[in-house]
């Protein structure tokens, strides 16, 4: 089994690891499928691509019968199988079988924290946000290891790219020193950003 790892939105080339000459194409059937669902077929030189792959998939016959998937999505992850059948003695017989496992990485960038003064009060508001990752994120605010209550946390998913965006607001009393951590967990991974507030100098700075 061949393993291919790519970033989301990139191009993945999955090789069947087999070549068929132009002359042999008329007697050859080629199938690409993902977990038993059809991706594309080529029968006697005529190709057919299944609807969910039509707008993103290309068949490169000259390069080991590879399929090229453009604009990778998280749902493209999985095991692809290439089957080559050749017509011999009144029947199609299997000439080649290959499996390719595709992993699609979609890491959230380090979140950014911006802050706003709320007029006529000692309250300051900070907003932590990041986007472009997968799977669904869970955001939490921490101070001294203790979880804080956010005002509101929104998680949205782009239906086209399948990627998530997350944003959360936190209000704090600006008369005391603070060190807040915005922690985002997704799958087995995590990213974080720290926001420090110093009352003596009335300044703040994120840790990078």
């Amino acid at each position: 089994v061949i393993h291919v790892t790519k970033e989301v939105k990139e191009v993945a080339t999955l090789s069947c690891g087999h070549n068929v000459s132009v002359e042999e194409l008329a007697q050859t059937r080629i199938y690409w499928q993902k977990e038993k669902k059809m991706v594309l077929t080529m029968m006697s030189g005529d190709m057919n691509i299944w609807p969910e792959y039509k707008n993103r998939t290309i068949f490169d016959i000259t390069n080991n019968l590879s399929i090229v998937i453009l604009a990778l999505r998280p749902s493209d992850e999985g095991t692809y199988e290439c089957v080559v059948l050749k017509y011999e003695k009144d029947a199609f017989k299997r000439e080649h079988l290959a499996e390719v496992t595709l992993s699609v990485k979609a890491d959230f960038p380090t979140p950014s924290i911006s802050d706003f003064e709320i007029p006529t009060s000692n309250i300051r508001r900070i907003i932590c946000s990041t986007s472009g990752g997968f799977p669904e994120p869970h955001l939490s605010w921490l101070e001294n290891g203790e979880e804080l209550n956010a005002i509101n946390t929104t998680v949205s998913q782009d239906p086209e790219t399948e990627l998530y965006a997350v944003s959360s607001k936190l209000d704090f009393n600006m008369t005391t020193n603070h060190s807040f951590m915005c922690l985002i967990k997704y799958g087995h991974l995590r990213v974080n950003q720290t926001f420090n507030w110093n009352t003596t100098k009335q300044e703040h700075f994120p840790d990078n």
């Epitope: 132009v22 002359e23 030189g45 707008n55 998939t57 290309i58 490169d60 016959i61 000259t62």
Partner: nanobody
Framework: EVQLVESGGGLVQAGGSLRLSCAAS????????MGWFRQAPGKERDFVAA????????YYADHVKGRFTISRDNAKNTVYLQMNSLKPEDTAVYYC??????????????WGQGTQVTVSS
């Protein structure tokens, strides 16, 4: 740079035939396939058919299967689109394009200027 020049368009009655040509010049060796697309007034550009440089493999959009045939002449560096049983809904500007990846509906890089096909009822 690749240059593509389409020809063969015109006015034809429903049920009639036309043969479009696309002459390619320049760095065509960097492409693995060529395709035909069409764009009707006020609509998006739609895939019609594609063929590998060797001519051994073809790919058609469902709405033209059985009516249109794509072929190529390597000696002339030209790709053809034979259009039979034409319908008024086939009226569009037809473009040819090159694909550096292979056979498919996407990934095309160089485009011709287009040739108008009008099918009257």
């Amino acid at each position: 740079e690749v240059q593509l020049v389409e020809s063969g368009g015109g006015l034809v009655q429903a049920g009639g035939s036309l043969r479009l040509s696309c002459a390619a010049s320049g760095r065509t060796f960097s492409s693995k396939a060529m395709g035909w697309f069409r764009q009707a007034p006020g609509k998006e550009r739609d895939f019609v058919a594609a063929i590998t440089w060797s001519g051994g493999s073809t790919y058609y959009a469902d709405h033209v299967k059985g009516r249109f045939t794509i072929s190529r002449d390597n000696a002339k560096n030209t790709v053809y689109l034979q259009m039979n049983s034409l319908k008024p809904e086939d009226t569009a500007v037809y473009y040819c394009a090159t694909n550096p990846y292979g056979l498919g509906q996407v990934g095309y890089d160089y485009w011709g200027q287009g040739t108008q096909v009008t099918v009257s009822s």
